[in-house]
Interface confidence: medium
Amino acid sequence: EEELQVIQPDKSVLVAAGETATLRCTATSLIPVGPIQWFRGAGPGRELIYNQKEGHFPRVTTVSDLTKRNNMDFSIRIGNITPADAGTYYCVKFRKGSPDDVEFKSGAGTELSVRAKPSAPVVSGPAARATPQHTVSFTCESHGFSPRDITLKWFKNGNELSDFQTNVDPVGESVSYSIHSTAKVVLTREDVHSQVICEVAHVTLQGDPLRGTANLSETIRVPPTLEVTQQPVRAENQVNVTCQVRKFYPQRLQLTWLENGNVSRTETASTVTENKDGTYNWMSWLLVNVSAHRDDVKLTCQVEHDGQPAVSKSHDLKVSAHPKEQGSNTAAENTGSNERHHHHHHHHHH
């Protein structure tokens, strides 16, 4: 009779994480008598996966009934596969011996490869807000996938970005991998409603990529433009001066009125109006009692936006003319000085 051979017909088996792997093994003879064992790896450091004779292997089930005398099928199923189960599995026939069984013959081995899905990409932006024209970095991370091949793309509002760097770790062989990518995005004033998207495509996703997003509203700061104007006279000795605070984001804003450098009033932006681009407008007004002033009055609208250094705009109120004429035929000059280099406005009301 021909000597027993251990046949492992599958050179490799590919299984998705969470599924059951079937590792096939048959013997060509019933002789010699002795148990079968399954190992992962070869050599002295090999790991016992299943022992027909003894032991408890909760994840392993046999395909056929190994207790039957004429059984020659030693295939096993391993449940709930994870990337850590990847490796080469050997079906090994032992010969009955005393005191210990002796290894008789091994199969050629079956390489188990595990396909594992990447985790949902997590996109994170910079810790501090930045203003338009500045470049900010976003990172995207996804973990636990196998095999290593993966594609990552960045988008801003549907437009693919090209300025990014991606690493898949570890660089060597591993049971599973992680991807880390950093993209550079240039902010514009219109980006309050914009989104940055990281898209990950992997063989396990069957053409349906995973996406992670970050809203630029959490990253951008749009500084306000200021305009101070004098309104027509409302009463005999009163002049109404308004400060228009336009196109700012986020809403956190504090406005202070100064008369000749002295604080007159401080208020916080509350009833703002929202622009289509997501920025806000706000208007504050100051009623100035002209009769209380002998000389011209320098009115300053000072705005502190989102904890940044204050920007201001000034307006010179001429009180030398008869108050009734304010807003009719006396030139009230707006000598704007906006430190953020916004346009100088010189308004003359007739």
Epitope: N167, D169, P170, V171, G172, E173, S174, H180
Partner: antibody, heavy 119, light 107 residues
Framework: QVQLVQSGAEVKKPGASVKVSCKAS????????MHWVRQVPGQGLEWMGW????????KYSQKFQGRVTITRDTSATTAYMELSSLRSEDTAVYYC????????????WGKGTTVTVSS | DIQVTQSPSSLSASVGDRVTITCRAS??????LNWYQQKPGKAPKLLIH???SLQAGVPSRFSGSGSGTDFSLTINSLQPEDFATYYC?????????FGGGTKVEIK
Amino acid sequence: QVQLVQSGAEVKKPGASVKVSCKASGYTFTSNAMHWVRQVPGQGLEWMGWIKAGNAEIKYSQKFQGRVTITRDTSATTAYMELSSLRSEDTAVYYCARGDYYYYYMDVWGKGTTVTVSS
Amino acid sequence: DIQVTQSPSSLSASVGDRVTITCRASQSISDFLNWYQQKPGKAPKLLIHAASSLQAGVPSRFSGSGSGTDFSLTINSLQPEDFATYYCQQSYSTPLSFGGGTKVEIK
């Protein structure tokens, strides 16, 4: 035995390029990566990049990206490292080292090639 | 990029001493850490790969341990030929990076 033999010392002027070769013998050239590492006098080791000799996949350190080119000739079992736009701070010993494909350790090193950049 | 911090930068020891050098990675690198020895004017020599696996031909007085972010190289019973500079290197992520080195000098 496994050996990496590097080309001889070079003296270059700032702005020039240098190409260092590394001839491998004693093993299957295409079964390993080849790393390039440099050491500025009195300083530590700095990884520049690698080439996987089998499929010519290349990875460069961002620091040298655009200035370094790593190539290989499988028939000559030789790897090459070319560094362009040389400056005085590129004066260093340049090593090639055989790399493992799993842990990416460098188990065999060349003796090093001294490159001096001076006007 | 992963930074690898080695300490101490230098140490003085006597023949027969037990010496430990540590290496810390800025993020978890599993066991993707290797140790090298370099003598003046010579190329580095691999001592230990995969955090704790002794390279063939390296004396057993050298041993490595650690996983994740903290690693160490120990030389049991320092020999005259062990006075050199030692470098750790992470091979988890590109760019591959080396520690700054530890110079072991004779006391």
